[in-house]
């Protein structure tokens, strides 16, 4: 007869490991007992369990409650055992020693490999600001056994660097993603992808990029100066900018206080019916935590009567 087993049994942390040991005997041969031991190099054999044809299953105190026979029906020639709730410390070499009648004793070894799936973590780097050079956007760390693979999935242009730390029974892998921040990256996803044989599918952690910036400010509303004449209603100036975080707006008049009746509504400056006293230099001040910008415009409120008089003069002059 001969023993049938596996060279390697692979199990995920917390799962049950079946350690196979089947005696393929000739007719009439019987298995008296199967002794399972852990036999790591440099250490003596440590009893795991003894399966006896008459006495049944004996489990070593060190494995009490963790070793069982596979559920029925059982073949009397099958010396396999189940190791419940495999932990990393169970990884190693195991030996089954089968005593048969009349053929004698047989033994076989297998290696138990316990996969420890990683629990990845993503840590954002320092605040990203437009104008910075190459900056850490995020780092992703995953520890497992064997060492996990850590990659990045993103549309954003950047560079990656990885480092690995080996521990006694596992390895930690850290990957960093660096980029040159620009406003176009704002709101873009940066995804850490962790692969490992103990995972049914890759684990993904997504970080949304936030790049602080503030665009140049400009003022809209003076495109047609002829509209800015005495008596006009509904005149307004709008300050244009964008930023992250969203900016706040403030309006001032460079050559004095804002005229009475002028309303400030965020980025918009609303005028009452125009008079000449609304003429002046207006400043839009845009700011966020990252920066501030100013844009100024000159408002010149026209008097239609003056204009028509001049026209008459010009005509008469011709």
């Amino acid at each position: 007869g001969e023993l049938e087993t596996s060279d390697v049994v692979t199990v995920v942390l917390g799962q049950d490991a079946k350690l196979p040991c089947f005696y393929r005997g000739d007719s009439g041969e019987q298995v008296g007992q199967v002794a399972w031991a852990r036999v790591d190099a440099g250490e003596g054999a440590q009893e795991l369990a003894l399966l006896h044809s008459k006495y049944g299953l004996h489990v070593s105190p060190a494995y009490e409650g963790r070793v069982e026979q596979p559920p029925p029906p059982r073949n009397p020639l099958d010396g396999s055992v189940l190791l419940r709730n495999a932990v990393q410390a169970d990884e190693g070499e195991y030996e089954c020693r089968v005593s048969t009648f009349p053929a004698g004793s047989f033994q076989a070894r297998l290696r138990l490999r316990v996969l420890v799936p990683p629990l990845p973590s993503l840590n954002p780097g320092p605040a990203l600001e437009e104008g910075q050079g190459l900056t850490l956007a995020a780092s992703c760390t995953a520890e497992g056994s064997p060492a996990p693979s850590v990659t990045w999935d993103t549309e954003v242009k950047g560079t990656t660097s990885s480092r690995s730390f080996k521990h006694s029974r596992s390895a930690a892998v850290t990957s960093e993603f660096h980029l040159v921040p620009s406003r176009s990256m704002n709101g873009q996803p940066l995804t850490c992808v962790v692969s490992h044989p103990g995972l049914l599918q890759d684990q993904r952690i997504t970080h949304i990029l936030h790049v602080s910036f503030l665009a140049e400010a400009s003022v809209r509303g003076l495109e047609d100066q002829n509209l800015w004449h005495i008596g006009r209603e509904g005149a307004m100036l709008k300050c244009l900018s964008e930023g992250q975080p969203p900016p706040s707006y403030n309006w001032t008049r460079l050559d004095g206080p804002l005229p009475s009746g002028v309303r400030v509504d965020g980025d918009t400056l609303g005028f009452p019916p125009l008079t000449t006293e609304h003429s002046g230099i207006y400043v839009c001040h845009v700011s966020n935590e990252f920066s501030s910008r100013d844009s100024q415009v000159t408002v010149d409120v026209l008097d239609p009567q003056e204009d028509s008089g001049k026209q008459v003069d010009l005509v008469s002059a011709s």
């Epitope: 009893e47 003894l50 008459k54 006495y55 049944g56 004996h58 070593s60 105190p61």
Partner: antibody
Framework: EVQLVESGGGLVQPGGSLRLSCAAS????????MSWVRQAPGKGLEWVSA????????YYADSVKGRFTISRDNSKNTLYLQMNSLRAEDTAVYYC????????????????WGQGTLVTVSS | DIQMTQSPSSLSASVGDRVTITCRAS??????LAWYQQKPGKAPKLLIY???SLQSGVPSRFSGSGSGTDFTLTISSLQPEDFATYYC?????????FGQGTKVEIK
């Protein structure tokens, strides 16, 4: 025929010592683990100590640990129990018995027993 | 240590009676259980090993059953020579421990 014959029992004062012997015949002595089991007068059976076939492993009940020593001489087919610091509660018939090693520290039931030797601890 | 609880502690029966003695272990011991018979002034004698295997030379009226924690010794038809004290013993762990015994007396 398997035979186990105990000797060495007798009357001893509390605090005294005694050495019991068990002569074995009719089987390959070194292939079997051996045990001492005692029975106080009118009481049940109490396991005392055991030793592996080679003598490399010894086991003791908590009640005798540090006072009793089990040993064997495979060349003489003899099992011993050295009993020191004897107490009144050690009074009992002491039996030797044999058992087979299955594997590791797992043994069969004791299939053969000696006739016993009486140890009386009294002042 | 594993505690072995035997019941009853004594019983009276007549020749020809069917006698059942039970033994309970405080934890699972698979079939690492033996039954012994002891007569006054004599050494214990192994009747049953591995919970249900009959020791060579023991009459077939003796039988054992059970595994795990609950075990039974049955004498199918009590004979005059069977009046004795019966002990169960576990040898799953060290120290091996005995039940307190069951004395079978003549009714």
């Amino acid at each position: 025929e398997v035979q186990l014959v105990e000797s060495g029992g007798g009357l001893v004062q509390p605090g005294g010592s005694l050495r019991l012997s068990c002569a074995a015949s009719g089987f390959t002595f070194s292939s079997y683990a051996m045990s001492w089991v005692r029975q106080a007068p009118g009481k049940g059976l109490e396991w005392v100590s055991a030793i592996s076939g080679s003598g490399g492993s010894t086991y003791y009940a908590d009640s005798v640990k540090g006072r009793f020593t089990i040993s064997r001489d495979n060349s003489k087919n003899t099992l011993y129990l050295q009993m020191n610091s004897l107490r009144a509660e050690d009074t009992a018939v002491y039996y030797c018995a044999r058992a087979e090693l299955l594997a590791f520290d797992v043994y069969t039931a004791s299939d053969y027993w000696g006739q016993g030797t009486l140890v009386t601890v009294s002042s | 240590d594993i505690q072995m609880t035997q019941s009853p502690s004594s019983l009276s029966a007549s020749v020809g009676d069917r006698v059942t003695i039970t033994c309970r272990a405080s934890q699972g011991i698979s079939s690492y259980l033996a039954w012994y018979q002891q007569k006054p002034g004599k050494a214990p004698k192994l009747l049953i090993y591995a919970a249900s295997s009959l020791q060579s030379g023991v009459p077939s009226r003796f039988s054992g059953s059970g595994s795990g924690t609950d075990f039974t010794l049955t004498i199918s038809s009590l004979q005059p020579e069977d009046f004795a004290t019966y002990y169960c013993q576990q040898h799953y762990t060290t120290p091996p421990t005995f039940g307190q015994g069951t004395k079978v007396e003549i009714k």
